[in-house]
Amino acid sequence: GVAPKAVLLLNPPWSTAFKGEKVALICSSISHSLAQGDTYWYHDEKLLKIKHDKIQITEPGNYQCKTRGSSLSDAVHVEFSPDWLILQALHPVFEGDNVILRCQGKDNKNTHQKVYYKDGKQLPNSYNLEKITVNSVSRDNSKYHCTAYRKFYILDIEVTSKPLNIQVQELFLHPVLRASSSTPIEGSPMTLTCETQLSPQRPDVQLQFSLFRDSQTLGLGWSRSPRLQIPAMWTEDSGSYWCEVETVTHSIKKRSLRSQIRVQRVPVSNVNLEIRPTGGQLIEGENMVLICSVAQGSGTVTFSWHKEGRVRSLGRKTQRSLLAELHVLTVKESDAGRYYCAADNVHSPILSTWIRVTVRIPVSHPVLTFRAPRAHTVVGDLLELHCESLRGSPPILYRFYHEDVTLGNSSAPSGGGASFNLSLTAEHSGNYSCDADNGLGAQHSHGVSLRVTVPVSRPVLTLRAPGAQAVVGDLLELHCESLRGSFPILYWFYHEDDTLGNISAHSGGGASFNLSLTTEHSGNYSCEADNGLGAQHSKVVTLNVTGTSRNRTGLT
């Protein structure tokens, strides 16, 4: 740092002496002991040859000194007066001090009725005093003098001293306001320092500081710290800054010059839109966050978010920050599209690039339908299984099941349904289902039952009687059976063209019809099988019924 000033002291401590008298000057340094090195003395700015720290002087003028550890002291004017009456001021004197003035005659015991004056006016209560105290002096150009009566034999002669300009030293330097920047960037911190220097001869004096913008006090007003930290400067903080320093006793107050501080606004640049989840791929129902940020930009930034095809903005935020977020809750299919954001802190908004948002829709429960050439599917039919989810983002993979067996899968690259074909056999009856999956979770259809019906084959009619030949009174069993065909099968029994009756068979083994024979039962018998897919007729079987003679009865 800067070396402290040396301090020049007088002994006796009066700045005015009578001609012929001697005054001792002592040079002292605050930070170093007196023994350290040479002392340089100056008289009216001329270097004296003496190098001691204490010298005797008899010549008037301005004296200064300097030691190795200090810088040049302030000048002290020492006057050697040839006059008969002198006014002396105690040295040193600082602003705000109470100073002792002494009116001294060359022959002081013959000097009386001393009166003290300031700027030609008599100081109150200053009559006939050896010395007076002037309270709280300041560094003005006030002139002091005194008058007295000198006894000259039997006469009292009034004498007047020469005017005295008291050498009042600055207690502390005039403050200078220093700012860490005169053109701070908006949003940046700034430090204001009210710089002054207290006289090293008065280290015990306590100062307080206050900083101002225009006419407004900054911070908490008076503070013992000369420094004020402003965390962030904004454009409205531009203005004229100054500071004041005063002693805590309010005796001395000094004000700095004004400093103009202009807060600079950085226009926004590099506006960027980011979407969470990253990549902008969302699933319907998720929450989306649109993050608009700027690489640079100060002050209050207005952010806005926009979607292609929408006139009004999605949202707008004005804040002192380099980024802002817009939350879109529970996204829908209609939220898909292109987005951009804008940021503005000057006159015109800067736009980000477009970002595409895709909203993927989980598949809905698919519906399985059958498409067949007829209402009742039969063996050999080509069955089309059609599975379709009415909602769901493509591509959708459909899987087809019979009971629990995976029949196959089919993809719908652009949505819609998918089909699977089966050439039906008797074993394809059962429960069918499908599921749809687009990577967001599979959904299963309800089961749909299919019955593959088999047309009946030509039935075989068998006549069963107790004996080899049918006779009147026998119980005849007519048995009709189709070896192939889906149940239920309705069997019809015929005698000639007459219908004897019908029997429904719900399982294999055919159906039987019983007759108690009479002679009239002779003739042709047949049967018919029908399961709704077309009736099939048996071959005709002839029956001869005879009376009691069994040997004439036979089955053909």
Partner: antibody
């Protein structure tokens, strides 16, 4: 009663082709899929392929594509399997079996020996 | 392809004992698994369909269980006529079928 009667044993030289048969009875031939299975000596079973007798639609195990050809004759309720470009690796017992997802009824098997 | 692993490959038992044969699938095949018995010099015969459904004609001492990837064929009180090979077969992905390597059940 469901029966599958397969043709007798075959002995062929490498490079030849063989066609074996499987005659179905006791059920309606066109109502059920016909399957073919290979069983190498002391080994497990390998599914060769299926044929739907109704329309001749075939499904093959990738391993046997180009090796086996399945056909049917509806009029005689007979299924056929032809194996071409025979090698010693083709020596095995070949079964026909009825069924859609499982092998409900099996033929007695046809033994094929390929030897030079 | 779905791989079926049967264990053990060989199993020696005394008639009257009870045994469990295992079949493990390389992926979930739900209940699409069937069991076959093949006696020496004979064709295979379907015993159990869809993991646990007995075929008509299958003795009640044969029971199937399991679902997904782990399946078991249990023979309670083995009889002399039960000795031979046992195969499992999956039909999960129509029309691609695979068989297990088989378990040989023999008399101790």
């Amino acid at each position: 009663e469901v029966q599958l009667q397969q043709s007798g044993p075959e002995l062929w030289k490498p490079g030849a082709s063989v066609k074996m048969s499987c005659k179905a009875s006791g059920y309606t031939f066109t109502d059920y899929y016909m399957k073919w299975v290979k069983q190498s000596h002391g080994k497990s079973l390998e599914w060769i392929g299926d044929i739907n007798p109704n329309n001749g639609e075939t499904f093959y195990n990738q391993k046997f594509k180009g090796k086996a050809t399945l056909t049917v004759d509806k009029s005689t309720s007979t299924a056929y399997m032809e194996l071409n470009s025979l090698t010693t690796e083709d020596s095995a017992v070949y079964y026909c079996a009825r069924g859609l997802y499982r092998f409900d009824y099996w033929g007695q098997g046809t033994t094929l020996t390929v030897s030079s | 392809d779905i791989v079926l692993t049967q264990s053990p490959a060989n199993l020696s038992v005394i008639p009257g004992d009870s045994v469990s044969l295992s079949c493990r699938a390389s992926q979930n095949i739900r209940n699409n698994l069937h069991w076959y018995q093949q006696k020496s010099q004979e064709s295979p015969r379907l015993l159990i369909k869809f993991a646990s459904q007995s075929m008509s004609g299958t003795p009640s001492r044969f029971t199937g269980s399991g679902s997904g990837t782990d399946f078991t064929l249990t023979i309670n009180t083995v009889e002399t006529e039960d000795f031979g090979m046992y195969f499992c077969q999956q039909s999960n992905n129509w029309p691609q079928y695979t068989f297990g390597g088989g378990t040989k059940l023999e008399i101790k």
